[in-house]
Interface confidence: low
């Protein structure tokens, strides 16, 4: 009698390893004999597809060599024209030994940045990924983590992170190792020992010493007053990633000498700078009479303090006035790095406006001194503690160079703005307007012994110091 098809053995989930054989059985009872078709993920498997073998009148489907793309849902459908077609479905789970599909690569990274060593894996069950550094399993810590993808992420890379790494992918079927890769940590150039400033007699020898480190080891170049050193001899030695450079000079004029340490990171460079002044005793004393000329300020140190395109007085009692006055503020400016945040901007304004005085052009170019009130404001209000310390050092002879004394005005000798408002220069940075408090807040502890006029506050300038490191 005709009998509608019945699937007597429903399809089961089949686990199979890659390259192994996998078989689904779909036993059918029916009369007449049914036609059995197979689908994978609802797509018909063609009888002539050589990757499959269909036997026993279609009741056995064999995948001859399993690939990882074979996982999915397999269904058999039996139909003999009697009753409806019947279907049974089962899953093929392709089990796979771990395989590293995206292995780690050699990495060069700058200290402090984030490094990611890839390690993408395949396998079923999903492999767990661990990492080996050198010969030991890598322990995760606050900076080091194995991501879910298997990649190794290292935050804030340190020199000690450099070394050889490999990833290990493991599941119940086996273990796969990546090739060994190298993590190289590069470090920005950094100056360990800056050259020291010297005050010497004309015609003497001076050796400036500069030590720097970095990975790769930096090169050191010397700059004299903004140009490559034209005279002098340089000796260099390198030991344990530290470069030591000595510049020996025969001194015939004062100068600003800059040691520049540079190393390369790919296409970029990192640079560290340190400067020292070499001054000549007696050289810096200006002549009694004010001889000089007006010119636009073209220096660097006072850029942030002086008005844009300021006309300043350049004193011709110096052989090279621009150079000498810039050197003067540069030396004093470095001293200001350690003063309080309240004092520093005020002192910088006073220093720059005192050394590069405003200039009144005319038949006889005349420097316009700072108004006494502003000088006293710096001395007694903003920098009282620091000023005392400096005067004490001066009295004890700790400042050997007269350059320091030149850069600090004697407030009592300056003209008052109440005598002739046009005869002295104001420091807009020190003005404090209660309606527009852009600059310094008033002192609350005690009333200053100086009246700062309530002039409109100037915000034309910001006090900023160039960073030590620059990427070029």
């Amino acid at each position: 009698l005709p009998k509608a098809p019945v699937i007597t053995t429903p399809l089961e989930t089949v686990d199979a390893l890659v390259e192994e054989v996998a078989t689904f059985m779909c036993a059918v009872e029916s009369y007449p004999q049914p036609e059995i078709s197979w689908t994978r993920n609802k797509i018909l498997i063609k009888l002539f597809d050589t990757r499959y073998s269909i036997r026993e009148n279609g009741q056995l489907l064999t995948i001859l060599s399993v690939e990882d793309s074979d996982d999915g849902i397999y269904c058999c459908t039996a139909n003999n024209g009697v009753g409806g077609a019947v279907e049974s479905c089962g899953a093929l789970q392709v089990k796979m030994k771990p395989k590293i599909t995206r292995p780690p690569i050699n990495v060069k990274i700058i200290e402090g940045l984030k490094a990611v060593l890839p390690c993408t894996t395949m396998g079923n069950p999903k492999p767990s990924v661990s990492w080996i550094k050198g010969d030991s399993p890598l322990r995760e810590n606050s900076r080091t983590a194995v991501l879910e993808s298997g990649s190794l992420r290292i935050h804030n890379v340190q020199k000690e992170d450099a070394g050889q790494y490999r990833c290990v992918a493991k599941n119940s079927l086996g273990t796969a190792y990546s090739k060994v890769v190298k993590l190289e940590v590069e470090v920005f150039a950094r100056i360990l020992r800056a050259p020291e400033s010297h005050n010497v007699t004309f015609g003497s020898f001076v050796t400036l010493h500069c030590t720097a480190t970095g990975i790769p080891v930096p090169t050191i170049t010397w700059i004299e007053n903004g140009n490559a050193v034209s005279s002098g001899s340089i000796q260099e030695s390198v030991k344990d990633r530290v470069i030591d450079s000595r510049l020996q000079l025969f001194i015939t004029k004062p100068g600003l000498y800059t040691c520049i340490a540079t190393n390369k990171h790919g296409e970029k460079f990192s640079t560290a700078k340190a400067a020292a002044t070499v001054s000549i005793a007696e050289w810096s004393k200006p002549q009694k009479d004010n001889k000089g000329y007006c010119a636009q300020y073209r220096g660097e140190v006072c850029n942030a303090v002086l008005a844009k395109d300021a006309l300043v007085f350049l004193n011709t009692s110096y052989a090279d006035p621009e150079e000498a006055q810039e050197l003067l503020v540069h030396t004093a400016w470095n001293e200001l790095k350690v003063v309080s945040p309240l004092c520093r901007p005020a002192a910088e304004a006073l220093l720059c406006n005192h050394v590069f005085q405003e200039c009144s052009p005319g038949v006889v170019p005349t420097p316009i001194p700072i108004c006494r009130e502003y000088c006293l404001a710096v001395k007694e209000l903003f920098c009282a503690k620091e000023w005392l310390a400096m005067e004490e050092k001066t009295h004890r002879g700790l400042y050997r160079s007269e350059m320091h004394l030149l850069s600090v005005p004697e407030c009592s000798k300056l003209p008052s703005m109440h005598w002739d408002p046009t005869a002295c220069a104001r420091l807009p940075h020190l003005d404090y307007n209660k309606e527009n408090p852009k600059t310094f807040p008033p002192m609350t502890s005690s009333k200053p012994s100086v009246d700062i006029p309530n002039l409109p506050s100037s915000s034309s300038s910001s006090f900023s110091v160039s960073p030590t490191y620059s990427m070029t």
């Epitope: 089961e12 996982d71 899953a91 789970q93 069950p125």
Partner: antibody, heavy 121, light 112 residues
């Protein structure tokens, strides 16, 4: 940000029906298997049903077979659980959970906040 | 019917180490059961901690580790923190049938 948001829970009488939905966002929905897991008040977790990435097959806990139907609409990034012939023992918070791989097999690596189903007369 | 067993409750001092286990009422747990561990704090959805015996999910602190020892799966918390106080569930695949994913009864961990 990966998110799974269940809805459709509520109070239903024994023998009644409910359809739970789970809206997915923040990941490629049609790349992952999905599951429903429930938790009766004060009790532990209980796996209910699973479906692979393509919806080509469905799996159920023995006690819900024939009553519950899991399905998915990949275009709408939504997972469903149609619950018929509900019994008082089906009372639970129902969580929608994402599998760590394409097939219905794999750890449940992301969960929704759950929707409460109360079966009571 | 085989049941997945866990300790009903355990306690640990802050900074201490505790091991939660996951067994079968008959037979041994092996890596072929792909033990998974989940954490659930009161009023919250569960959170995946460990999958396939010993692999940590992303964002899970390294103090959580998984293993199989003897005939059980184990979750070890080294240097327990107050925020680790929660219910912990293990889940196993029973046999090769992917339809059969079974949770244990859960362990209530108290950090004293």
């Amino acid at each position: 940000e990966l998110q799974l948001v269940e809805s459709g829970g509520g109070l239903v009488q024994p023998g009644g029906s409910l359809r739970l939905s789970c809206a997915a966002s923040g990941f490629t929905f049609d790349d992952y298997g999905m599951s429903w897991v429930r938790q009766a008040p004060g009790k532990g977790l209980e796996w209910v049903s699973a479906i692979p990435w393509n919806g080509g097959s469905t799996y159920y806990k023995e006690s819900v077979k024939g009553r519950f139907t899991i399905s998915r609409d990949n275009a709408k990034k939504t997972l469903y659980l149609q619950m018929n012939s509900l019994k008082s023992e089906d009372t639970a918070v129902y969580y929608c959970a994402k599998r760590s791989g394409r097939i219905a097999f794999g750890a449940l690596d992301a969960w929704g906040q759950g929707t409460l189903v109360t079966v009571s007369s | 019917q085989t049941v997945v067993t866990q300790e009903p409750s355990l306690s640990v001092s802050p900074g201490g180490t505790v091991t939660l286990t996951c067994g079968l009422s008959s037979g041994s747990v092996t890596s072929s059961n792909y033990p998974d561990w989940y954490q659930q704090t009161p009023g919250q959805a569960p959170r995946a901690l460990i999958y396939s015996t010993n692999s940590r999910h992303s964002g899970v602190p390294s103090r959580f580790s998984g293993s199989t020892s003897g005939n059980k799966a184990a979750l070890t918390i080294t240097g327990a923190q107050p925020e680790d106080e929660a219910d912990y569930y293990c889940a196993l695949y029973m046999g090769s049938d992917i339809r059969n994913y079974v949770f244990g009864g859960g362990t209530k961990l108290t950090v004293l």
